[in-house]
């Protein structure tokens, strides 16, 4: 070993070196949180970049760059260090137009904390392992969601466009002439029934157990879907999103109430099945796989 390499190894294995890097990363993170950093922080940035460069140089000199089993680039954690340094120099010395987009990569510096703290490294390792094991469960989840999305598509396609429309139109107005002239939400409120505080027109349906319109209004299928058009079963992708919402129980009761009002109370069976299978079974299956992966990693 050359004297330079011996010195590099001594520095690399020293506990103070790890402490220095850890403190640098944490300080850097504090500086990154500043809203309007003063001018002098530019010099501090250069200091941080210098320390990271020094760290990487020490590692490269001690372990070698990429030829051989235990060299610098053979460790995935060092890829992160390498990317951080490359982007630090890129944003500083190369004019690449939209620098603000590249500056986003400075946030990767915070991730360096993982490689420095051993406990955190283990947890992240377990997380990566669990993701690998999750592939089968994910396939099952996507398959189940797809099946139910297709069922939802068949049952509820277009239903959430049903609205309560005002009967008492002007003598020569028609549904079409009105829809062509409606622009603002104010206009919509003139012709469609809105419950107090609601941002969407009252939903209704054509089956006996679906929601009915108040007196003076009739149920029509017109306009866009609720929630700015994002809530619907009109295409497979929207239906899939709705099913994902049910699975994650993300304000699912609103989707449930909207659909039941537009389609009929009978369809609660669909929601019961989806909540039981998707939300209770599949979510817990995912959690079980993650728990098993952590257990294996600990052993």
């Amino acid at each position: 070993f050359s004297p330079l390499r011996r010195i590099s190894i001594k520095i690399l294995v020293h506990s103070l070196f790890s402490m220095l890097i850890m403190c640098t990363i944490l300080t850097n993170c504090i500086f990154m949180t500043m809203n309007n950093p003063p001018d002098w922080t530019k010099n501090v940035e250069y200091t941080f970049t210098g320390i990271y460069t020094f760290e990487s140089l020490v590692k490269i000199l001690a372990r070698g760059f990429c030829v051989g089993e235990f060299t610098f680039l053979r460790d995935p954690w060092n890829w992160l260090d390498f990317v951080v340094i490359v982007f630090a120099y890129l944003t500083e010395f190369v004019n690449l137009g939209n620098v603000s987009a590249l500056r986003t990569f400075r946030v990767l510096r915070a991730l360096k904390t993982i490689s420095v703290i051993p406990g955190l490294k283990t947890i992240v390792g377990a997380l990566i392992q669990s993701v690998k094991k999750l592939s089968d469960v994910m396939i099952l989840t996507v398959f189940c969601l797809s099946v139910f999305a297709l069922i939802g598509l068949q049952l509820f396609m277009g239903n959430l466009k049903h609205k309560c429309f005002r009967n008492s139109l002007e003598n020569n107005e028609t549904l079409e002439s009105i829809m062509n002239t409606l622009e603002s939400e104010e206009d919509f409120r003139k012709y469609f029934y809105y419950l107090e505080g609601s941002k969407d027109a009252l939903l209704c349906g054509f089956s006996t157990d679906s929601g009915q319109c108040p007196e003076g209004y009739t149920c029509v299928k017109i306009g866009r879907n609720p929630d700015y058009g994002y809530t619907s079963f009109d295409t497979f992708s929207w239906a899939f999103l709705a099913l994902f919402r049910l699975m994650t129980q993300d304000y699912w009761e609103n989707l449930y109430q909207q659909t039941l009002r537009a389609a009929g109370k009978t369809y609660m069976i669909f929601f019961v099945v989806v909540i039981f299978l998707g939300s209770f079974y599949l979510i817990n299956l995912i959690l079980a796989v993650v728990a098993m992966a952590y257990e294996e990693q600990n052993q």
């Epitope: 429309f165 008492s168 549904l175 054509f206 009739t218 029509v220 299928k221």
Partner: nanobody, 124 residues
Framework: EVQLVESGGGVVQPGGSLRLSCDAS????????MRWHRQGAGKQREFVAR???????DYADSVKGRFTISRDNAKNTVYLQMNSLRPEDTALYYC??????????????????WGQGTLVTVSS
């Protein structure tokens, strides 16, 4: 496809009566308002009477007290009972309705439909 068919038109003497009917056919789920309009020779189409799905009625000033609009929801039909007819009532009478129906492929469509018209002639 939704169709509106008017019937009951004909020639009648002034002061006489006629009953027009308009039948809506197709895979109808719901009919909102149903209206009668008329168009005299060389004139613009004008509103005559309207009835909503909850049977609220409205009439043009020129026919108030003489004409009565009614509907039979079970048959998807609207009627216009015309009494005390005058020569100025001579026109082609059109039926107009807001219909929500199940169309090809099972999807639902709402729209305003018109009939072909039935001719009413009031002359001595």
């Amino acid at each position: 496809e939704v169709q509106l068919v008017e019937s009951g038109g004909g020639v009648v003497q002034p002061g006489g009566s006629l009953r027009l009917s308009c039948d809506a056919s197709g895979r109808i789920l719901r009919i909102g308002y149903m209206r009668w309009h008329r168009q005299g020779a060389g004139k613009q189409r004008e509103f005559v009477a309207r009835i909503t799905d909850d049977s609220a009625t409205d009439y043009a000033d020129s026919v108030k007290g003489r004409f009565t609009i009614s509907r039979d929801n079970a048959k998807n039909t609207v009627y216009l009972q015309m009494n005390s007819l005058r020569p100025e009532d001579t026109a082609l009478y059109y039926c107009n309705a807001l219909v929500t129906a199940s169309v090809r492929g099972g999807s639902i469509h709402s729209g305003t439909y018109w009939g072909q018209g039935t001719l009413v002639t009031v002359s001595s």
